[in-house]
Interface confidence: low
């Protein structure tokens, strides 16, 4: 018995749902009361999903997993697993018994992507050409660990006194710290690189020091240019600095985190004490980096309704404030592809290929297009259900008529994360196959 | 100039950034055509993506530590004659033009029948 999963290793983002594809060729009378299928870890063998004498038989991993009910009969054997997490990484082997027998095995590789970095310089004030002075980068909850580099504002590499070290916490992801030491020249730019080898995504910072700047008293609050795009589920940092001034105290700072078009308080930091989170519960200061001029705010499990404009006001003596967006994504899910009719297809029928892809944020863009890569862009009709979440479930659908063979591919794309999810399948009279992932 | 058949590499160098931060991607454009992709080739190396009509005879490749990335043209034909352009990718589909930033004045290679 042939079993099929992809070659390349499936890429999931922590938080998101991944399907292991297994496919196997059913025999013809085949039922699924003949059906033994087991997925296992590789390695160890622990039971994840099974399903026998008919009976989907459950999940035995932390009631994550699901399998496709209604795509078996087809030899459609893969696995959804849900909320991946980075214990999750690993290779996953799919077991089919029917009369004869046979497994493979497919490898799970995890992937979080580094929050844009922060730059911290010490010592930050009373600068002067020949200085010595450390610049901090630093970025979190990415995975795997990541590669940093460092360059000038040429943009030659920096590869001398530079240290960097990575710590996991408890749900394996990794924050990020590396420590570059320069001498001052009359003016300086430092640019901060961390890559995530995986989904090969850069995060970049930058600090233009300019020694020994006249002093003018303003409260300069500084915040990202782009918005920052956070995945739902996740935590996302909105960053916001200020200068304080010599003998600044946290006694002297007013902070205030609230919604741009709204005016409603989100946050607030005042008479020296964090007065806490007035957005159910789900903001937090960094308190050990409010004396240094960081201001920013930490956002939790982020929601689709938190997409928007956030203010940052500072006052000390002086006050100010600037406005970050935050922009909410949500990865659309591998597309599934149902054919109606489905059996005894002959050139010349006329089919409907619809194309499913689930909770993804913000709308998705789709594209149809044939074996040979040309966009197939007539009679196709497509529609987009936002949930209770906001998340969008999106469904196109393509009537075409069949040729001696062909295949139909349809890609949907997250404008926000560029992430495409791609479903194909090929007809070739009868029947029809579901092609393996390159 | 070369014969139907033979092999030629092309080479592009890259100055004034970080090279080994960037993919790289090989246009071509045939007299009276429109320009077309070619390959492309992520900014470690790792991975390359090809024009369908072209795997297997083309193959693109990198040296970081030269700045440089290569193509290798392999059993030329005479339909192979065009200019040839490097660009530095920025972001989208690799093999959309749009993608790309930055472009070199182009090479022109002439197959003889």
């Known amino acids: 018995l042939e079993v099929q999963v992809p070659e390349d290793p499936v890429v999931a983002l922590v938080g998101t749902d991944a399907t292991l594809c297994c496919s196997f060729s059913p025999e013809p009378g085949f039922s699924l009361a003949q059906l033994n299928l087991i997925w296992q870890l590789t390695d160890t063998k622990q039971l994840v999903h099974s399903f026998a004498e008919g009976q989907d038989q459950g999940s035995a991993y932390a009631n994550r997993t699901a399998l496709f009910p209604d795509l078996l009969a087809q030899g459609n054997a893969s696995l959804r697993l849900q909320r991946v997490r980075v214990a999750d990484e690993g290779s996953f082997t799919c077991f089919v018994s029917i009369r004869d027998f046979g497994s493979a095995a497919v490898s799970l590789q995890v992937a979080a992507p580094y929050s844009k970095p922060s730059m911290t310089l010490e010592p930050n004030k009373d600068l002067r050409p020949g200085d010595t002075v450390t610049i901090t980068c630093s970025s979190y909850q990415g995975y795997p660990e990541a590669e940093v580099f460092w360059q000038d504002g040429q943009g030659v590499p920096l590869t001398g006194n530079v240290t960097t070290s990575q710590m996991a916490n408890e749900q394996g992801l990794f924050d990020v710290h590396s420590i570059l030491r320069v001498v001052l020249g009359a003016n300086g730019t430092y640019s901060c690189l961390v890559r995530n080898p995986v989904l090969q995504q850069d995060a970049h910072s930058s600090v233009t020091i300019t020694p020994q700047r006249s002093p003018t008293g303003a409260v300069e609050v500084q915040v990202p240019e782009d918005p920052v795009v956070a995945l739902v589920g996740t935590d996302a940092t909105l960053r916001c600095s200020f200068s304080p001034e010599p003998g600044f105290s946290l006694a002297q700072l007013n902070l205030i985190w609230q919604l741009t078009d709204t005016k409603q308080l989100v946050h607030s930091f005042t008479e020296g004490r964090d007065q806490g989170s007035a957005y159910a519960n789900r903001t937090a200061l960094f308190p050990d980096l409010l004396a240094q001029g960081n201001a920013s705010l930490r956002l939790q499990r982020v929601r689709v309704a938190d997409e928007g404009s956030f203010t940052c006001f500072v006052s000390i003596r002086d006050f100010g404030s600037a406005a970050v967006s935050l922009q909410v994504a949500a990865p659309y899910s591998k597309p599934s592809m149902t054919l109606e009719p489905n059996k005894d297809l002959r050139p010349g029928d006329t089919v409907t290929i619809t194309c499913s892809s689930y909770r993804g944020y913000p709308e998705a863009e789709v594209f149809w297009q044939d074996g040979q890569g040309v966009p197939l862009t007539g009679n196709v009709t497509t529609s987009q259900m936002a949930n209770e979440q906001g998340l969008f479930d999106v469904h196109s659908v393509l009537r075409v008529v069949l040729g001696a063979n062909g295949t139909y591919s349809c890609l949907v794309r997250n404008p926000v994360l560029q992430q495409d999810a791609h479903g194909s399948v090929t007809i070739t009279g009868q029947p029809m196959t579901f092609p393996p992932e390159a | 100039l070369v014969q139907d058949g033979d092999s030629l590499r092309l080479s592009c160098k890259a100055s004034g950034g970080t090279f080994s931060s960037y993919a790289m991607g090989w246009f071509r454009q045939a007299p009276g055509q429109e320009r077309e992709f070619v390959a492309a080739i992520s900014s470690e190396g790792g991975s390359t993506y090809y024009a369908d009509n072209m795997e297997g005879r083309f193959t693109t490749s990198r040296d970081n530590a030269k700045n440089t990335v290569y193509l290798q043209m392999n059993s030329l034909k005479p339909e192979d004659t065009a200019v040839y352009y490097c660009?530095?990718?920025?972001?989208?589909?690799?093999?959309?033009?749009?993608?790309?930033?930055?472009w070199g004045q182009g090479t022109q290679v002439t197959v003889k029948p």
């Open positions: 660009a530095v990718k920025g972001v989208g589909w690799p093999q959309e033009q749009a993608s790309y930033d930055y």
